[in-house]
């Protein structure tokens, strides 16, 4: 077990009758009290506030209001704390708290409590929605929590409204009891304002209680006026009208995506949209509501507009041989024609779709370059450029050679590569390597993917040297012995230490 109490959160009794508050409690088994005591407090759980003592098992001392009117029906040893209050009067209405006293430090005022309501009229329950033409159930309910006095129910002014059905004594969710009598009938507009009564009497007593309720027959709204679907060009003016019939007049609400745009208690409501934008495209709902029901209708607004500037997603850098996938997307109404160009050549196109996927299998250096994605509908055209960079190992082009002129030799090493390679000239017969960093002898210039490195040799020598050009990037290296063109005289310059 654990500390806990169970009692109805609220309980009712007719003035002058009695009330039994069902109660049970629990505590940890290991506490093993020799004897269990208990106290019922009125209106406050804090002993420091000196609340009136309703009942105390250790002594007979109780507050004067409860003298001779309180008795414990439960057996505390069996963890039953049921309390009986007799001859209840209005001042006994309030909160009732139970405190378990197990000796030692184990005294626990349970936070669970019962609120006692002293009543003097039966409760006639008319459904919140009494709608003309729909069968309704009206009930008369009275508390039946006094074991000594049981109420009897009868209807007043129910002629022409059907025969009552007595349900008898019913147990409520929290263990309290009620006597219930039911009336079933179909209300008409004419029944509006009809006064219906219920009487509770207690046999062998003079106690008698009456209650009345006026019938209020209503009907829910019906939307009777509404635009059909609307098409509008971006920037134009749109008016949406909603009208409803109901009693009482409804609250009319124009909504979109759960957001209230305009509302008023009225029979019709106009929603004006100035200079509509694509953001206002969608379904608009008119909700008509009163206390007895609701109706709703929707209207679609379609805002037509030119495509937005396309966005391009995908791999913009690829290695030769890889497959490249590029997605071009936009938004427009209606959906556009999407096209991807490279150098005025159409690579892919799609009609009335907002996305276009371009797949380039096994890209080559020729695929490197600028591409355009163009979106177009009857309201306009937008384009976005993007660059695809294809990376590959160096390729030494055939125009690479050496040529002699008077006292110099010039060697051209022409390399196509991405990314840019490093270039070195090797003179094996001299055991010398000249890197492009040695600006005195090597001049390099790049045009697109082609790098031209020029080695200039000055001086005098008997025979032209062998020159090997090596180009290298992260994808590999290529070497080529440069062929000589023209005369074989050579001036030689000493390079290095």
């Amino acid at each position: 077990g654990h500390w806990g109490a169970w009692m109805p959160s609220s309980i009712s009794a007719f003035e002058g009758t009695c009330v039994s508050i069902p109660c049970r409690f629990d505590f940890p088994d290991e506490l093993r009290p020799a004897v269990v005591h208990g106290v019922w407090y009125f209106n406050s759980p804090y002993p420091k506030n000196y609340p009136p003592v309703v009942f105390k098992s250790r002594t007979q001392v109780v507050h004067e209001s409860f003298q001779g009117r309180s008795r414990l029906l439960g057996d505390l040893g069996l963890r039953n704390c049921t309390l009986l209050l007799s001859n209840v009067s209005p001042e006994l209405g309030g909160k009732y708290y139970f405190r378990g006293d197990l000796g030692g430090y184990n005294q626990y005022t349970f936070s669970e409590h019962s609120v006692l309501d002293i009543v003097n009229t039966p409760n006639i329950v008319v459904p919140p929605e009494v709608v003309a033409g729909t069968e309704v159930e009206v009930s008369c309910m009275v508390p039946d929590n006094c074991p000594e006095l049981r109420p009897e129910l009868s209807w007043l002014g129910h002629e022409g409204l059907g025969e009552p059905a007595v349900l008898g004594r019913l147990r409520e969710d929290e263990g309290t009891w009620v006597q219930v009598s039911l009336l079933h009938f179909v209300p008409t507009r004419e029944a509006n304002g009809h006064r219906l009564g219920c009487q509770a009497s207690f046999p062998n007593t003079t106690l008698q209680f009456e209650g009345y309720a006026s019938m209020d027959v209503k009907y829910p709204p019906v939307i009777v006026e509404m635009n059909s679907s609307v098409e509008a060009i971006e920037g134009s003016h749109v008016s949406l009208l909603c009208g409803a019939d109901s009693n009482p007049p409804p609250l009319l609400t124009w909504m979109r995506d759960g957001t209230v745009l305009r509302e008023a208690v009225a029979e019709s409501l106009l929603l004006e949209l100035e200079e509509v934008t694509p953001a206002e495209d969608g379904v608009y709902a008119c909700l008509a509501e009163n206390a007895y029901g609701q109706d709703n209708r929707t209207v679609g607004l379609s805002v037509m507009y030119a495509p937005w500037k396309p966005t391009v997603n995908g791999t913009m850098v690829a290695v030769e041989g890889e497959t490249v996938s590029i997605l071009c997307s936009t938004q427009s109404n209606p959906d556009p024609i999407l096209t991807i160009f490279k150098e005025k050549q159409i690579l892919s196109t799609v009609i009335y779709e907002s996305e276009l996927q371009l797949e380039l299998p096994a890209v080559s250096p020729e695929d490197d370059g600028e591409y355009w994605c163009v979106a177009e509908n009857q309201y306009g055209q937008r384009a976005t450029a993007f660059n695809l960079s294809v990376e590959f190992a160096p390729v030494l082009l055939l125009e690479s050679h050496c040529a002699a002129a008077r006292d110099t030799v010039q060697c051209l090493c022409v390399v196509k590569s991405n990314p840019e390679p490093s270039v070195a000239f090797e003179l094996p017969s001299r055991n010398v390597t000249v890197n492009e960093s040695e600006r005195e002898f090597v001049y390099s210039e790049r045009s697109g993917l082609v790098l031209t490195s020029i080695l200039t040799l000055r001086g005098q020598a008997q025979a032209p040297p062998r020159v090997i050009c090596t180009a290298r990037n992260l994808y590999g290296a290529k070497s080529l012995e440069l062929p000589f063109q023209g005369a074989h005289r050579l001036m030689w310059a000493k390079i290095g230490p």
Partner: antibody, heavy 126, light 112 residues
Framework: QVQLVQSGSELKKPGASVKVSCKAS????????MNWVRQAPGQGLEWMGW????????TYADDFTGRFVFSLDTSVSTAYLQISSLKAEDTATYFC???????????????????WGQGTLVTVSS | DIVMTQSPDSLAVSLGERATINCKSS????????????LAWYQQKPGQPPKLLIY???TRESGVPDRFSGSGSGTDFTLTISSLHTEDVAVYYC????????FGQGTKLEIK
């Protein structure tokens, strides 16, 4: 520092009454309960009960109902034990001891008596 | 009520030696809601009030030397003094504070 100072020794005749005081200092008086423990000469410890200093509600052990009354004067942070109709077997040292409490429900996080008064010897003899 | 029984009633131990006092409760003092044992150990010297040594069966009160330790759960508990000092001569009480509070009869510890 926490201190519980008890009143001095008492010599009483059978049938008389005695009131032992326990003055607390060094802590918030109403945040701790006050227990009373009896120790007869050469004997062990007997718990008599406690008083909730926040609510003023006393609780007595089964053997200490009737002639024993716990009370408080929170304005001077003092707890009292009154014994009426004294008997020879009431001769003992009476200790006060504090323990943490919870003023509303129950708080099982420390009901151990951590600080004790020095004790008051009550001798009942004709 | 829960009855607490200590053993032995008296105990003589040499200085520096280990002293062990046992306490048995007639019912478990382990509280199911928080899995704590509601058991304390007190030391009482002649003419003085009891002094709290251990609570929750094994938690040492601040200022208590670490040669004092408590163990056990449910119904069987032990107070151990790992190395007896002269100032440890006293009567030791176990105490349950789960239900209506009770003490053991006490164990008198002396130097051999």
């Amino acid at each position: 520092q926490v201190q519980l100072v008890q009143s001095g020794s008492e010599l009483k005749k059978p049938g008389a009454s005695v009131k032992v005081s326990c003055k607390a200092s060094g802590y918030t008086f109403t945040n701790y309960g006050m227990n009373w423990v009896r120790q007869a000469p050469g004997q062990g410890l007997e718990w008599m009960g406690w008083i909730n200093t926040y609510t003023g509600e006393p609780t007595y052990a089964d053997d200490f109902t009737g002639r024993f009354v716990f009370s408080l004067d929170t304005s001077v942070s003092t707890a009292y034990l009154q014994i009426s109709s004294l008997k020879a077997e009431d001769t003992a040292t009476y200790f006060c001891a504090r323990n943490p409490i919870n003023y509303y429900g129950i708080n099982y996080e420390g009901y151990v008596m951590d600080y004790w008064g020095q004790g008051t010897l009550v001798t009942v003899s004709s | 009520d829960i009855v607490m029984t200590q053993s032995p009633d008296s105990l003589a131990v040499s200085l520096g030696e280990r002293a062990t006092i046992n306490c048995k409760s007639s019912h478990s003092v382990l509280y199911s809601s928080n899995q704590k044992n509601y058991l304390a150990w007190y030391q009482q010297k002649p003419g003085q009030p009891p002094k709290l040594l251990i609570y929750w069966a094994s938690t040492r009160e601040s200022g208590v030397p670490d040669r004092f330790s408590g163990s056990g759960s449910g119904t069987d508990f032990t107070l151990t003094i790992s190395s007896l000092h002269t100032e440890d001569v006293a009567v030791y009480y176990c105490h349950q504070y789960l239900s209506s509070l009770t003490f053991g009869q006490g164990t008198k510890l002396e130097i051999k």
